[in-house]
């Protein structure tokens, strides 16, 4: 395991897989597209989603303090957003080809996930909200969402890991 | 079963209007993006353009764009192709498609209509 | 708009032969956007392959993809009898383009 006994994780490969992330959650749904969906309604499905904010430890000095605050939110993070890629909004009409990079995300949000789950302890997950689109086609304006705050949870996540790697690593 | 059909072949003057259908069937035809493709007589195929009927979001090809228009009705699962004015060079196959999600956004057209032949002479 | 060449423009082998088919474009392809479809005479068009190397549903193993960047190649290990067709390549990244296809044959 990476935390064991609650210690500081393997940053390095903490570091090289959050990197694997943010390439894949890029490639699941990239900037530039030949189309993207319009955005209708106001309506925000995505509020309940994890954010990795100021007071959670994971600026430098919070690092060095205690990482365990900052790797707890991150890790919560990971696992919510674990569920709701193997959830029915992902694996529904319209299905995803198989190899689709959404499916090599959803199996690495779980491996980093593992790594930072300490041995004999198991951090608090936050419950994934009820989103049920009533329309089928509705699941891909989610689906972009979901993605889109991802990505922005992802690049929170590797920015933290390689500042682990290079400062905190044994 | 996945299937698209479309409707049958039409023969037609210039200057002529003309909608051509593709009926989806055995899926979620409102969620996946049905896109239209252009074979000349003894030619390659060419990206038309393509529709998500659950909301009608539409995008073409430049070299179509404003030369056909691209519709659907949902509640039938029916994607249409028309021209207010056919020309003689508009003779071709045309097949309409539903494109697979690689990603959220695009992917590979995995199931095809059989194809609508249009045939425009004077 | 991304122009893909295909190459050679017919192919003139005989069944149990192996066929390589290039697909070369204009400027650089994600391999994740790459597919290639077979067409039969009078029949529509047929997926083989997309994201540069996975096989399609159904599709026997025989045919393989691979390449990246510009550069993609389709391989039939050992041509069947039903495997004489036209081959096109297809980018569907950004505005869809199509190869003009390449003709396989019997020799």
């Known amino acids: 395991r990476a935390v064991p006994g609650g210690s500081s994780p393997a940053w390095t490969q903490c570091q090289q897989l959050s990197q694997k992330l943010c390439t894949l959650a890029w490639s699941a749904h990239p900037l530039v597209g030949h189309m993207d969906l319009r955005e209708e309604g106001d309506e925000e499905t995505t509020n309940d989603v994890p954010h990795i904010q100021c007071g959670d430890g994971c600026d430098p000095q919070g690092l060095r303090d205690n990482s365990q605050f900052c790797l707890q939110r991150i890790h919560q993070g990971l696992i919510f957003y674990e569920k709701l890629l193997g959830s029915d909004i992902f694996t529904g009409e319209p299905s995803l080809l198989p190899d689709s990079p959404v499916g090599q995300l959803h199996a690495s949000l779980l491996g980093l996930s593992q790594l930072l789950q300490p041995e004999g302890h198991h951090w608090e997950t936050q419950q994934i909200p009820s989103l049920s689109p009533s329309q089928p086609w509705q699941r891909l304006l989610l689906r972009f969402k979901i993605l889109r705050s991802l990505q922005a949870f992802v690049a929170v996540a590797a920015r933290v890991f390689a500042h682990g790697a290079a400062t905190l690593s044994p | 079963e996945e299937q698209l059909v479309q409707s049958g072949a039409e023969v037609k003057k210039p200057g002529e209007s003309l909608k051509i259908s593709c009926k989806g069937s055995?899926?979620?035809?409102?969620?996946?993006?049905i896109g239209w493709v252009r074979q000349l007589p003894g030619k390659g195929l060419e990206w038309m353009g393509i529709?998500?009927?659950?909301?009608?979001?539409?995008r073409y090809s430049p070299s179509f764009q404003g030369q056909v228009t691209i519709s659907a009705d949902k509640s039938i699962s029916t994607a249409y192709l028309q021209w207010s004015s056919l020309e003689a060079s508009d003779t071709a196959m045309y097949y309409c498609?539903?494109?697979?999600?690689?990603?959220?956004?695009?992917?590979?057209?995995?199931?095809w209509g059989q194809g609508t032949l249009v045939t425009v002479s004077s | 708009e991304i122009v893909l060449t295909q190459s050679p423009g017919t192919l003139s082998l005989s069944p149990g032969e192996r066929a390589t088919l290039s697909c070369r474009a204009s400027?650089?392809?994600?391999?994740?956007?790459l597919a290639w479809y077979q067409q039969k005479p009078g029949q529509a068009p047929r997926l083989l392959i997309y994201?540069?190397?996975s096989r399609a549903t159904g599709i026997p193993d025989r045919f393989s993809g691979s390449g990246s960047g510009t550069d993609f190649t389709l391989t039939i290990s050992r041509l069947e009898p039903e495997d004489f067709a036209v081959y096109y390549c297809?980018?569907?990244?950004?505005?869809?383009?199509f190869g003009g296809g390449t003709k396989v044959e019997i020799k």
């Open positions: 498609a539903r494109q697979a999600y690689y990603d959220l956004l695009t992917g590979p057209f995995d199931y």
């Open positions: 055995g899926f979620s035809f409102d969620s996946y993006w």
């Open positions: 529709i998500l009927p659950g909301n009608s979001d539409t």
């Open positions: 400027q650089s392809v994600s391999s994740s956007y």
């Open positions: 994201g540069a190397s």
């Open positions: 297809q980018q569907y990244g950004s505005s869809p383009t």
